[in-house]
């Protein structure tokens, strides 16, 4: 082009208000009306209106003249209810009376299917300590548990763990006061992500890998009932709950003497082709760098702000996007791919088999996931899960975003980092962290409480305008985040990943190690070594910092060689030395398994705490292989090898 | 398909209390609205209130001290009572079904004959 | 309280379009229906869901919602269309009908 051709430079600020201007114009609530119509609810995956509305978001991509738009075809099982309803009854220990409880309407996927009689007691939300802190042994007996705190498969696994041999979920009153005690609710019980049938390696139609299982699959039967069912099961149970439970006041501990509960599961395993939608917007410097934005498509119910929000987010973004490239002059330097999962309601299934499916090179290109799920369920509070590579980025943003409702800053705690909540199972930015190392985020506008109708089958929209009348406003806002984030991440020639903020991580982690130096003395190990690593990875950020500095910004080969520095340092907390198949989240910060930090140390608790469990062999390799999964980190950070001190 | 037929006292006196009831046929009574709603003399549609197959009851706030739904699912029924009526409850009362679509919202897709009920001294 | 206001008469030409509006605030953030009353009868359902025709409701009978207002549009009128209509949305677990529109076909 000729320099009279040339685009004019648009920075930070042209850029923000930009995006600000062109969602002022954006009817998010028309969006998200448009997805709560007939033709596109229920849209359970796999079903033929999830299809439809793939079909609509693809079409809706390519109306908006995205660089490209594609689909993935994945083959993956899952659970369904079976046309033989489950069901839960009271019997007499003899059998001398039988009484149906309810044939609920939900139904938990991936349960055992298996039929199982005992005495009933509530482990409140059937978290660890929940089950430490009962009375009643819950051993060869079923457990009841609340909705809400942990998920579903946690609750389960904790249930396993204490030898119970069934588990009912329901919703109380108090935590989801929902006037209808009769509305049925789903969820799954799989302690993990993606087709547990295909763990660790990708459901394409054409891999012929043998039958496998995820390890995270429980072994006991689990079913949703009604609140109804629960107050029918608590008029036949004794022992108040107690009130530090701020529960239900019908809520009872354990069956009577004379009668026992029987749960019946018989839910089908179904193979369904999901699809997962993807568009491009191509970076105009470094294409092969992209951000992914993505949001959930499916829900078993209506799924109104379950998983109709974060599609409308992702249309207006995909729409405002675009134009902001084709008719407004924006360059950004990286890619933007927006992607729509399916099977999001069975462990964000698809979007884990699209990481699964590009392991060994999706860490190489993608350096941020940005999830729109669930990001509009109240108006009260903004809250964010996030890797603290994204902590500066996001700080940034919240300083820059009104609160829709207030006016205000989103940003009025300069203690939110500390504050930020670990991304749980049930959240499509686990698997980007924990499993492929790719920094991720998500956040919603909410309430102090849950949105009560997740996974139920009043998730509608008319219960979503009517909680939220502001929605247009808040989904704005939502939207306004996003796209900050995103243009932050595609825009500078600097990416916008604080590396330095993994300091902090180490630095507490050591610290909460060094309260047992008394222990790891007595065993004659040293810490000595974890401080090096520890060390090593603060000086090489601080190198990183000093070659950024002095790099000439305008050298395009420098920047991306630093820049790429930068991109591996989340996927370098992956363990190295375990297998993705046998420990998909390898992440030793934010991962699960006994490579993790956290596991390291609550093992240590028990040398002082129950020593019979503590096993030395491996602790020893705990501490050995998180040194160096941190040493290895630090290397990868300071660049070639001829620049690594290796004192090690 | 389905069908409402309604029946009930046409001519009261000021604080009697009204009473219809609406059959069902042809049709499942779970998983419905079933509601009342009335139409004064040359004058628009006015909803009552409706009874939800969960077993609750909503009422129109005006209404809400004088009107009582309830079901006979057995014989797949439902009544309408007012009580304390007075000259200006005269008008056209329906029965109808309430179908929710997938919005949460819904509309009424089947309509009972409707019943003239005048209240006179 | 929550109302929606409709003009209580339209008049048209048979083989014109008739627009009858029904508006309220933020109506476009719910959803609308419409129902068709001729005298003497029970009302029909012929637009649910902002613009959804049940089974056996013609083609000329359209809806839309946006902003304040949702609007049906009969296209072709016939003199068969002569009727009350009426809208209706949700608020806060209450129904509300609109007062009514008298279309007359002349």
């Known amino acids: 082009k000729d320099d009279d051709d040339k685009v004019p430079q648009l920075y930070w600020d042209d850029l923000k208000k930009m995006l600000s201007e062109k969602l002022d114009t954006t009817d998010f609530t028309s969006t998200i009306k448009l997805l709560n119509e007939n033709s596109y609810v229920p849209r359970e995956a796999g079903s033929q209106k999830d299809e439809n509305l793939a079909w609509y978001i693809e079409n809706q991509f390519r109306e908006c003249k995205l660089s490209k738009v594609w689909r993935d075809e994945h083959f993956v099982k899952i659970q369904v209810k079976d046309s033989a309803q489950n069901s839960v009854t009271i019997t007499g220990t003899n059998s001398e009376f039988v009484y149906l409880v309810e044939n609920p309407g939900g139904y938990v996927a991936y349960s055992q299917n298996a039929t199982v009689t005992g005495k009933l007691v509530h482990a409140n939300f059937g978290t660890e300590k929940d089950f430490e802190d009962l009375d009643s042994p819950v051993n060869g007996s079923l457990v009841i548990v609340r909705a809400g705190k942990i998920t579903f498969a946690e609750k389960v696994a904790n249930a396993e763990s204490a030898n119970a041999i069934g588990v009912l979920i329901y919703m109380d009153k108090t935590k989801f006061p929902i006037v209808d005690a009769d509305v049925s609710f789903f969820g799954h019980a799989h302690l993990g992500t993606g087709d547990p049938y295909t763990p660790g390696f990708p459901s394409f139609n054409h891999t012929q890998f043998p039958p496998s299982r995820s390890s995270g699959l429980p072994n006991i039967p689990v079913q949703t009932i009604s609140r109804a069912a629960a107050e029918r099961l608590f008029e036949n149970m004794e022992g108040d709950c107690p009130s530090d439970w701020k529960t239900d006041s019908s809520c009872r501990m354990v069956t009577s003497q004379n009668k026992s509960v029987k749960l019946s599961v018989s839910n089908v395993m179904k193979e369904i082709k999901i699809l997962n939608i993807f568009g491009v917007i191509k970076g105009f410097v470094e294409p092969d760098r992209y951000v992914v934005v993505g949001a959930q498509r499916d829900s078993w119910g209506p799924g109104a702000a379950k998983s109709s929000v974060g599609t409308a987010l992702l249309l207006e973004l995909a729409q405002t996007f675009s134009d902001m490239v084709l008719k407004d002059g924006f360059q950004p330097s990286r890619s933007i791919v927006f992607a729509s999962w399916s099977a999001g309601d069975f462990g964000s299934v698809g979007a884990t088999e699209w990481l699964e499916g590009y392991l060994s090179s999706l860490h190489l290109k993608a350096f941020t996931f940005i999830n729109l799920d669930k990001a509009v369920l109240g108006t009260s509070n903004f809250r964010v899960s996030a890797s603290p590579l994204l902590y500066a980025l996001i700080e940034k943003t919240m300083q820059e975003v009104k609160h829709p409702v207030t006016g205000l800053s989103l940003y009025q705690d300069s203690n939110w980092a500390s504050k930020v909540e670990k991304l749980t199972f049930d959240n499509a930015a686990f698997p980007f962290l924990a499993y492929s190392g790719i920094p991720a985020v998500s956040f919603c506008f909410c309430e102090d409480t849950d949105y009560p109708y997740l996974g139920t089958t009043m998730d509608t929209y008319k219960e979503l305008i009517e909680k939220i009348p502001q929605l247009n406003k808040v989904a704005r806002a939502a939207a306004e985040v996003a796209g900050q984030f995103m243009i932050k991440l595609t825009h500078d020639v600097e990416l916008n990943l604080d590396y330095e903020r993994y300091n902090s991580q180490l630095l507490s982690f050591l610290r909460n190690l060094n309260q047992y130096r008394a222990d790891i003395r007595e065993m004659g190990l040293s810490l000595q070594w974890l401080y090096s690593a520890r060390g090593d990875f603060f000086r090489a950020t601080s190198r990183l910092t000093t070659d950024f500095k002095n790099s000439e910004k305008t050298d395009r080969f420098v920047m991306k060689e630093l820049n790429d520095r930068v991109m591996k340092v989340e996927y370098y907390f992956l363990s190295p030395y375990v297998s993705p198949r046998e420990s998909p989240f390898r992440h030793i910060f934010w991962g699960s398994g006994s490579h993790t930090l956290s596991a390291l140390l609550e093992h240590l608790k028990l040398r002082k705490t129950n020593n019979r469990a503590f096993n030395e062999t491996l602790f020893r390799n705990q501490l050995a292989l998180a040194t160096w999964t941190i040493q290895g980190a630090a290397n990868a950070l300071s660049g070639d090898i001829w620049d690594i001190d290796n004192e090690f | 398909q389905v069908q409402l037929q309604q029946w009930g006292a046409g001519l009261l006196k000021p604080s009697e209390t009204l009473s219809l009831t609406c059959a069902v046929y042809?049709?499942?009574?779970?998983?419905?609205?079933w509601t009342w709603i009335r139409q004064p003399p040359g004058k628009g549609l006015e909803w009552i209130g409706e009874?939800?197959?969960?077993?609750?009851?909503n009422y129109n706030p005006s209404l809400k001290s004088r009107v009582t739904i309830s079901v006979d699912t057995s014989k797949n029924q439902f009544s309408l009572k007012l009580s304390s009526v007075t000259a200006a409850d005269t008008a056209v009362y329906f029965c109808?079904?309430?179908?929710?679509?997938?919005?949460?919202?819904?509309?009424?897709?089947?309509w009972g004959q409707g019943t003239l009920v005048t209240v006179s001294s | 309280s929550y109302e929606v206001t409709q003009p209580p008469s339209v008049s048209v030409s048979p083989g014109q379009t008739a627009s009858i509006t029904c508006s309220g605030h933020?109506?476009?953030?719910?959803?609308a229906c419409w129902y068709q009353q001729k005298p003497g009868q029970s009302p029909v359902l012929v637009i649910y869901?902002?613009?959804k025709r049940p089974s056996g409701i013609p083609e000329r009978f359209s809806g839309s919602n946006s902003g304040n207002t949702a609007t049906l549009t009969i296209s072709g009128t016939q003199a068969m269309d002569e009727a009350d209509y009426y809208c209706q949305t949700w608020y806060s677990s209450t129904v509300i009908f609109g007062g009514g529109t008298k279309l007359t076909v002349l």
């Open positions: 042809g049709g499942s009574f779970s998983g419905y609205y």
């Open positions: 869901q902002d613009r």
């Open positions: 933020k109506l476009g953030d719910k959803f």
């Open positions: 009874f939800i197959h969960s077993g609750s009851t």
């Open positions: 109808a079904r309430g179908s929710m679509d997938s919005s949460g919202f819904y509309s009424f897709d089947f």
